[in-house]
């Protein structure tokens, strides 16, 4: 992604010395998502903005690192800085879901969703129902609305598939599950083909 790292760095470099110190202290107590560790206190307190950015990205990956930075900035009352990060997050299509599962699970090829891309684009008609099932846990609000804005089912599915390269296995499984519920016969047909 790259842009998220730059945005985090920009935000941290905008903090005064005291604010950066406060940011680090809050980072030591902020609630973390399950499966993520805390940056050790000793190392954290020594870091400048560049080191801290690198550590945030290496510990939490870009997507969640960006969100965590926003949370801490909001908690500090620095709304404007947090909003700038929110804009970056939306523009880069940083689906938080992509960071919610360790990265090694994202590389598996041959998933139903990848195998049947063309058929799904051509044959899924109840796209809005599929989107509703993916909202929030897979698609950001911006992505959801971007797909809905397309006029035909095929264009909607094409737009949806434009986000798939950044998805992990859980996200793809969510799409498959939604398709099974909304288009069960289509999924059965494709699984047998």
């Amino acid at each position: 992604m790259g842009r998220a790292r730059d945005a985090i760095l920009d935000a941290l470099e905008n903090l005064s010395g005291d604010e950066l110190k406060k940011f680090k202290m809050k980072l030591l107590t902020v609630q973390l998502r399950e499966g993520y560790g805390r940056i050790p206190r000793g190392a954290l307190l020594q870091m400048d903005a560049i080191d801290l950015t690198d550590k945030l990205v290496s510990y939490y990956l870009e997507s969640y690192g960006l969100e965590l930075t926003m949370t801490v900035l909001r908690d500090m009352g620095l709304q404007e800085l947090a909003e700038q990060l929110q804009t970056t997050k939306e523009e880069s299509g940083a689906v938080a879901a992509a960071a919610s599962v360790p990265a090694q699970s994202t590389a598996r090829t041959g998933h139903f969703v990848d195998q049947h891309r063309q058929a799904l684009i051509a044959r899924v008609t109840e796209v809005d129902g599929v989107l509703d099932a993916l909202h929030g846990s897979v698609l950001t609000e911006g992505q959801y609305q971007a797909v809905r804005a397309e006029t035909t089912s095929q264009d909607k599915m094409r737009k949806l598939f434009s986000f798939v390269p950044s998805w992990n296995l859980t996200c793809k499984d969510s799409l498959l599950q939604a398709l099974k519920e909304i288009h069960p016969y289509l999924v059965m047909d494709l699984e047998q083909s």
Partner: antibody, heavy 117, light 107 residues
Framework: EVQLQQSGAELVRPGSSVKMSCKTS????????ISWVIQRPEQGLEWIGY????????EYNEKFKGKATLTSDTSSNTAYMQLSNLASEDSAIYFC??????????WGQGTTLTVSS | DIQMTQTTSSLSASLGDRVTISCSAS??????LNWFQQKPNGTVRLLIY???SLHSGVPSRFSGSGSGTDYSLTISNLEPEDIATYYC?????????FGGGTKLEIK
């Protein structure tokens, strides 16, 4: 049975913060989102924001950005909302609601917040 | 923001009556409309989602209809336990917004 059990009534001083909880049961917590809704005295309902549990993805009503912070704890199947810099106009009932396919299907019983000096 | 308007803030009807509560949106909401019931004790429950789908456990005397900007909730055979305030809510666009509510009383 789907249940959302909210924490008890709060009486707090202006300028302080409060963190209310919404303990869920009867469904897979990580498969859903939780939304929060405010109802001021003798008034209607207003959406505050939502959090999707699986990934922590949040969206807020512009009116509540900086006021509300939504979090969750998957180990206890509990969603939280922290309200900061409280003023008398924040006195209200706050509901947590489960989101299913973008609509609100099950509501908590509400937490009454009173901000008074 | 999409404004949701329930023009009737309160209405009175007799037991057994057919009651219709209206709701209009300031722009089209593609049927992304819910109806909620709030009892006098404060409890809220979903009645209808996506304009006309009946939520599980809700009596079939409740029904919803509409499209575009105009929607309605109908109670076909009013019962004592239907005394409540009814809210419509759009979930087409953020911020999700509610109507002002219609308080239903028994004559």
């Amino acid at each position: 049975e789907v249940q959302l059990q909210q924490s008890g009534a709060e009486l707090v001083r202006p300028g302080s913060s409060v963190k209310m909880s919404c303990k869920t049961s009867g469904f897979t917590f990580t498969s859903y989102g939780i939304s929060w809704v405010i109802q001021r005295p003798e008034q209607g309902l207003e959406w505050i924001g939502y959090i999707y549990i699986r990934n922590g993805y949040t969206e807020y009503n512009e009116k509540f950005k900086g006021k509300a912070t939504l979090t969750s704890d998957t180990s206890s199947n509990t969603a939280y909302m922290q309200l900061s810099n409280l003023a008398s106009e924040d006195s209200a009932i706050y509901f947590c609601v489960r989101i299913h396919r973008r609509f609100f299907d099950y509501w908590g019983q509400g937490t009454t917040l009173t901000v008074s000096s | 923001d999409i404004q949701m308007t329930q023009t009737t803030s309160s209405l009175s009807a007799s037991l057994g009556d057919r009651v219709t509560i209206s709701c209009s949106a300031s722009q089209g909401i593609s049927n992304y409309l819910n109806w909620f019931q709030q009892k006098p004790n404060g409890t809220v429950r979903l009645l209808i989602y996506y304009t006309s789908s009946l939520h599980s456990g809700v009596p079939s005397r409740f029904s919803g209809s509409g499209s575009g900007t105009d929607y309605s909730l109908t109670i076909s055979n009013l019962e004592p336990e239907d005394i409540a305030t009814y809210y419509c809510q759009q979930y087409d666009r953020l911020p999700w917004t509610f109507g002002g509510g219609t308080k239903l009383e028994i004559k």
